[in-house]
Each structure stands twice: as C-alpha cells, then as structure tokens.
Interface confidence: low
Amino acid sequence: GDTRPRFLEQVKHECHFFNGTERVRFLDRYFYHQEEYVRFDSDVGEYRAVTELGRPDAEYWNSQKDLLEQKRAAVDTYCRHNYGVGESFTVQRRVYPEVTVYPAKTQPLQHHNLLVCSVNGFYPGSIEVRWFRNGQEEKTGVVSTGLIQNGDWTFQTLVMLETVPRSGEVYTCQVEHPSLTSPLTVEWRARSESAQSKMLSGVGGFVLGLLFLGAGLFIYFRNQKGHSGLQPTGFLS
Amino acid sequence: IKEEHVIIQAEFYLNPDQSGEFMFDFDGDEIFHVDMAKKETVWRLEEFGRFASFEAQGALANIAVDKANLEIMTKRSNYTPITNVPPEVTVLTNSPVELREPNVLICFIDKFTPPVVNVTWLRNGKPVTTGVSETVFLPREDHLFRKFHYLPFLPSTEDVYDCRVEHWGLDEPLLKHWEFDAPSPLPETTENVVCALGLTVGLVGIIIGTIFIIKGVRKSNAAERRGPL
C-alpha cells in the first residue's frame, strides 16, 4: 500500500449558541493533525497558542489589531448571521419518530426476555423513551443503545426492557419528542396473537364439545326416562 | 450551561494526497460541503438549497490557505507525520427489519484519521454498487473523523452483507457482517396443549353429543308413533 507519511491541517470555525442567540461564543481553531496549536476564543478576545507550535501564529495575528477586531465581531457578523440564515431548516427542523415494539428473543411466557422499543427517523435528537407495565413506569432493567445519528438528519434509538412477561400483562413504550404535541404510546401484550388464537380455539372447541355432549346426553337420557318399562300413559282429556 | 446548538465550519487539507474538504456542520449533521472538483455547493438534504445559498468559490480560497498553512506547519513541526488511528466500524439498519420490506443498511465508520478510507459493500461476498451513497468526512470533537456509507436493500433470508473498510491504520481490511435474523416462533407449549386437547375434546364431544342427540330424538319419535296402549 501507500506508506508515504501524511500531514494534515484542520481548521474549525465554531459558533456555540446558548438560549437561542442570547449568548454566543466564537472559536477560531487551528490543528496540525489532531493537535490544536492556536485558537481565537471570543471569551478571551485574542489568539492564544495552545501548544508551542502555535506561538508564532498567535504573536503574528495578535499584532494585527484590525484582524482581532474582525474576530471579536464574528459572534455577530459570522455566528448570529449564519444562525439566522439556517434557523428555519436546522434549529426549527422537526421530524416525528416511528415507534415499533417487539421481543428481542422469542421466549415463552414466564421466561427472561428483552422487550425492544425501536424509535426511528426522528429529529432533533432530544427524546424521552419510557417503559410502563400495566400502567406503572419501569425504571429498573431498562437498557438503551443511546442516541444513534444516522448521518442523514435523522436519529434512532433502541430502548430495551428486561422482563419476565406474564400472561395478561400489558407493556407500553411511551415516547416524548419536540415533534409531538402529546406522548406517543405503543402497547405490547404478554401473549402472541397465535398463542391467543390457539388458547381461544382450544377453549372454544372444548366448550362447544361439552355443550354438544351435554345437550346430547340431556336429550338422550330425557327420552330414555320417558319410555322406560314400556308403560305409556294415555292422553288425559 | 450546555450550549443548545453548535455550528462548525470545518476544513482540512491533507498532503501528499492533496485532498481538501470544506463543510458546515450543525449539531453533528452536515449542512453542506463543497465539491472541490466541480466547484459547487452540495447540500446534504436537497431542500436546504431552497432556504439558503453558499458561494462555493469562497471555500476554494480557504482550502488554498489551509494548504499554505499546512506547508508552514509541516516545516515548523520538523516534518512530523500523522499517526494513523484505525476506524471503529458498525453496521446497522435504518429501521426495524421486515422480510421483503425496503430498508437501508448503514455502515458507520468512526474515530479515525487521516481522512482517507476505502469502503466497499459486499452482498454474498460480491461487491455491490447499485444505489450506494456516502457522506463526506465529518468532524469529531476529538478531531478524528466519522463517515457514513449507505446501501438500500430488500431484506431476505438468503442474502448476507458485509461492509468492508480499508484504512492505513488497519493491518488488513475490516469486514462488518449483517444478516437477517429470522425470529423462530415461540414454543407456546401450554397454548398448544390447550388448543390440541380443547379441539380434540370438543370434536369428540360434538360427535358423541350429536350421536346422543340423534339417538334421543329417534327414540322420542319411535315412542310417539306407537302411541298409548
């Protein structure tokens, strides 16, 4: 492969915003490889060498008073300006999440399982995901992947609940997000649809069988009693 | 107090590759970058270009300055080269996987430098290029880099996928595997027993009950035909 030595220069002009644009901090940062060597910080007001490598730059740039004035003004001319230009599609961007709940492992009831609440495709990243069992919030046994950035202005997260599902229990994943006016909830019941239909089929069949059997026996024995000894009585007039 | 938002204009220049990048980052997402070859602004999401504009030529001048700065710094550092930091690679899907439902595989390449990487998608061991896309090199707070590669796909039980990553910090290409994990149905033993027994008992009950009903009705009919003695 290509084994030539590599040399990397990085520059980062950073704008940090607090409470909208009420407080703004501007940083002009220079890096050789990963090492920052000189920076202008609007909180300081001049260039400072971060390492010895940046001393000549700090001294030279600080000697240019007008350059310093330009950098001191950057919180307005650069930061607040760019915030204003991009605000409508960045700061105000809202994409609502899609929520899916499923068991991570296909375990029978009354076995340890992991219920997954998959929250996908939302923006911004600030989100709250809670688990409830029969209406009570579950705080223990909750594991999360944390916020995952998809790289396309959407996020996803998986929030798992370690539990032993019991028949009849209702698990609810509740999601709160800036794109939603009220929390989004998705339920999961501690019995699969196939299991439920099997139980219904079995019980239904059993009850139906018993009804038929009961009715048959009732009719049969009723008629049996009515004609026993072949002593029929005549009609009374 | 933690800041609410951060906008970063991030630039780099790498020698001897002579590769440069200019991009704007908002809270870790790319707003746009400048295509150095085409000298044009490339918006990360197409709709961004409807709200704002950026003169790409300005970025070229910045890159020229970064190049000049790099030459000064290279000399000033006594030609100290960069130390390769190999990437961490993760493959995930855009949303929960369902058979034959379109989805996207995401290959997330993280925590590496220098910003040069070769990424290939493999389906059943063979390279795939149809529909693939990627981001530029994205900055990190520790001044390493991140990158995303995407592969749209149709999940099936037959196909397996790999994201193959080459970087100077790796001794050999790194492959991250992904395949559809078909969930095996729950055993549902109790339900199966109840269902089988219930249906069996039910069926037997229905058959026997029907026989008794027929017999009972017949007896009743026969007795009525004989009449009183």
């Epitope: 000549p56 030279y60 007008d66 350059l67 330009q70 001319t77 | 020698n15 504009s53 003169e55 030529q57 300005g58 070229l60 001048a61 910045n62 020229a64 300055v65 190049k67 000049a68 030459e71 000064i72 290279t74 000399k75």
Partner: antibody, heavy 118, light 108 residues
Framework: EVQLVESGGGLVQPGGSLRLSCAAS????????MSWVRQAPGKGLEWVSA????????YYADSVKGRFTISRDNSKNTLYLQMNSLRAEDTAVYYC???????????WGQGTLVTVSS | DIVLTQSPATLSLSPGERATLSCRAS???????LAWYQQKPGQAPRLLIY???SRATGVPARFSGSGSGTDFTLTISSLEPEDFAVYYC?????????FGQGTKVEIK
C-alpha cells in the same frame, strides 16, 4: 526594516524571456505566501501569480498560464518570476507582494518595469 | 472570473469632504476576502482595508470599509490632501484574484 525589492526588469523582444527577482528582508520569508501583481502603463492592477510559503503550491492568472513560472528560494529569501514567450501586452511594472488567500497582500515592493517591444 | 466594477471612475472633491467609493462584484464575494488599496503616482499600492471592513496597520480612522455579497464601499469621512490618489478594490476569495479598474479621487 521590512521590505521587498524587485529586480530583473528591462527591455525584451516579443517571444523573449526574462527572470524577475524579489529580495525579501525584515520578516520570516518562508512563513508567507507571495504574489506577483503587474500594472500596465496608465492602467489598473492585475494579479499574475502566487506561491505558498514552502513553494509547494503555485497559482497563475489565465493570461500567463504556461508561459510564466513562479518559484522561491527560502534559503535566499528570494521570490522569482520566470517569464517566457513574452508578448507586447506583458509590458508593465511588476510588483512582488507579501501574502494571499486569507490575507490580502499587505507589503509591496517598489516594482520593476518590463518592456516587451521589437 | 469575478469581475469587480468600481464607480465612479473619477471623483472630484475638496479637502474635508466625504468620499464614497463603490465596488460591485459580478458574483457574491465573501466579505472576508475583499480589500481596498490606495495608489499614488509612481508608488506601489498600499493596503488600506482587508476583510471588507478591517483597517490595515497604520491606516487612519477616516478610512472605513463596508458591504457584503456583491456590493462593497470604501468611505473616507473627511478628505485630507494626501488622500487624493487612485483606489482599487480586490477580491481574494476566488482564483484568479481580481482587481477593480480603480477610482481616481482628485482635487476639485
């Protein structure tokens, strides 16, 4: 004293060559990018060429591309402009200037006259 | 290439008057990369303003620069006798770097 002094100008025939020099003093020459700017008699300023501090990057105006070569010798604190295939329209005062890119040229030499005529 | 058009070509004013020089770009120029120069006959240009509005070292406060995008202005608040000269704007945002054709400020 911080200064730039150009030399090498003169009269040359069309198609001929000339090499201009610019001696720098009073500052760390290798830390600065340098430019050549020219001014035809009675006309405005025209940027000609620029070179990075190490000499690794060079830039040219379309009007001189392929004919002029900018170079520098940092050990001698000297900037050069090799001019080949000279034309009448290259007649001008040639200034060497310190800086380009992030900073506009902030220090200029006094200029040297190049006349291209038969 | 970015074409810079300066207006007016000549400005006739008296000492003490305010001078307003315009520089219009054919396409948007980053304000960080626009400079103004002063040139007197037989002399090399002198940097007055860089970054559209920052005064270079030793430049009197009567000189000020403003503007963004395609329209830039150099203002001399009160003309001194030594200010009568030719003024050039230059963009160093896009290669090739270009100059305006100049505005001559002459004594009325």
């Amino acid at each position: 004293e911080v200064q730039l002094v150009e030399s090498g100008g003169g009269l040359v025939q069309p198609g001929g060559s000339l090499r201009l020099s610019c001696a720098a003093s009073g500052f760390t020459f290798s830390s600065y990018a340098m430019s050549w700017v020219r001014q035809a008699p009675g006309k405005g300023l025209e940027w000609v060429s620029a070179i990075s501090g190490s000499g690794g990057s060079t830039y040219y105006a379309d009007s001189v591309k392929g004919r002029f070569t900018i170079s520098r010798d940092n050990s001698k604190n000297t900037l050069y402009l090799q001019m080949n295939s000279l034309r009448a329209e290259d007649t001008a005062v040639y200034y060497c200037a310190r800086g380009y890119g992030r900073y506009s040229p902030d220090l200029w030499g006094q200029g040297t006259l190049v006349t291209v005529s038969s | 290439d970015i074409v810079l058009t300066q207006s007016p070509a000549t400005l006739s004013l008296s000492p003490g008057e305010r001078a307003t020089l315009s520089c219009r770009a054919s396409q948007s120029v980053s304000s960080s990369y626009l400079a103004w120069y002063q040139q007197k006959p037989g002399q090399a240009p002198r940097l007055l303003i860089y970054g559209a509005s920052s005064r270079a070292t030793g430049v009197p406060a009567r000189f000020s620069g403003s503007g963004s995008g395609t329209d830039f202005t150099l203002t001399i608040s009160s003309l001194e006798p030594e200010d009568f000269a030719v003024y050039y704007c230059q963009q160093y945002s896009n290669l090739p770097f270009t100059f305006g054709q100049g505005t001559k400020v002459e004594i009325k």
